[in-house]
Amino acid sequence: EDELQVIQPEKSVSVAAGESATLRCAMTSLIPVGPIMWFRGAGAGRELIYNQKEGHFPRVTTVSELTKRNNLDFSISISNITPADAGTYYCVKFRKGSPDDVEFKSGAGTELSVRAKPS
């Protein structure tokens, strides 16, 4: 059977400062069971951008409604983009673990570049 794939269709996205950036991500399956999180950067120093379960992410909204059944769309939108937001964003599927979830598969990443705000 086909294993879950994490699809980030855009390799890069360019957004003007002050605008919102939409970072797209889709899963091909509902299983294995476990959460999806967004990070900027890779490796040990990566920054958590969005985790629905815990944390406060006031600039991040999910593209699909949080109450949508059997959702496979895990795209997010980040508002009020600044140059400091530039970087590569990864959509990551975790496999449910006890007590800790285990990283299962990552998308290829989407590089966000920030253009100067039009004068």
Epitope: E3, I31, P32, I36, L66, T67, R69, N70, N71, K96
Partner: antibody
Amino acid sequence: VQLVESGGGVVQPGGSLRLSCAASGFSFSNFAMTWVRQAPGEGLEWVSTIGSGDTYYADSVKGRFTISRDNSKNTLYLQMNSLRAEDTAVYYCAKDSTVSWSGDFFDYWGLGTRVTVSS
Amino acid sequence: EIVLTQSPATLSVSPGERATFSCRASQNVKNDLAWYQQRPGQAPRLLIYAARIRETGIPERFSGSGSGTEFTLTITSLQSEDFAVYYCQQYYDWPPFTFGGGTKVEIK
């Protein structure tokens, strides 16, 4: 959606049983599946859940019960070993459903199969 | 493990009346809570998920509310088929998935 459990019966303490759940009416391989049990006159108790290769168990059955699935047969199984009197219950098979970024609840249930552990 | 406490254990209501009962979680489960109905001799049936969303086909007289640790299921104008046991279930933090002990709604 239809879920039909079978394999229940009367077994002596220390014995084994294998429960089956035949699923139809949905794309079985795309969903996690769960066993929930109900002791006589008692409430509902989660037993085990399976995603793709990922399996999860209640502490009360860990090491004794094994959940598995055969996607080619649209069938869920629960192998129950070292059975105890406290395992006596109606065992329900349930289809998992998710809400967007959250965990699982159970949107379809079978009618259950009764397991009695008694000498 | 998150413990769900349902109250009251038994609720006696006359047909046509309103029934309200609660489910309290031992810790915050956000909106990750479902409600099930179980009629005598039958399997449980999903009524509500995400604390407040009615499952397809569930009558409008059933409504869920609350978030965090306090949740309520309300049945307006009880019908004869509504006399059953009602369970809440959290899916915020698992394993294990946990259920409340149930509220039995009986005819007054």
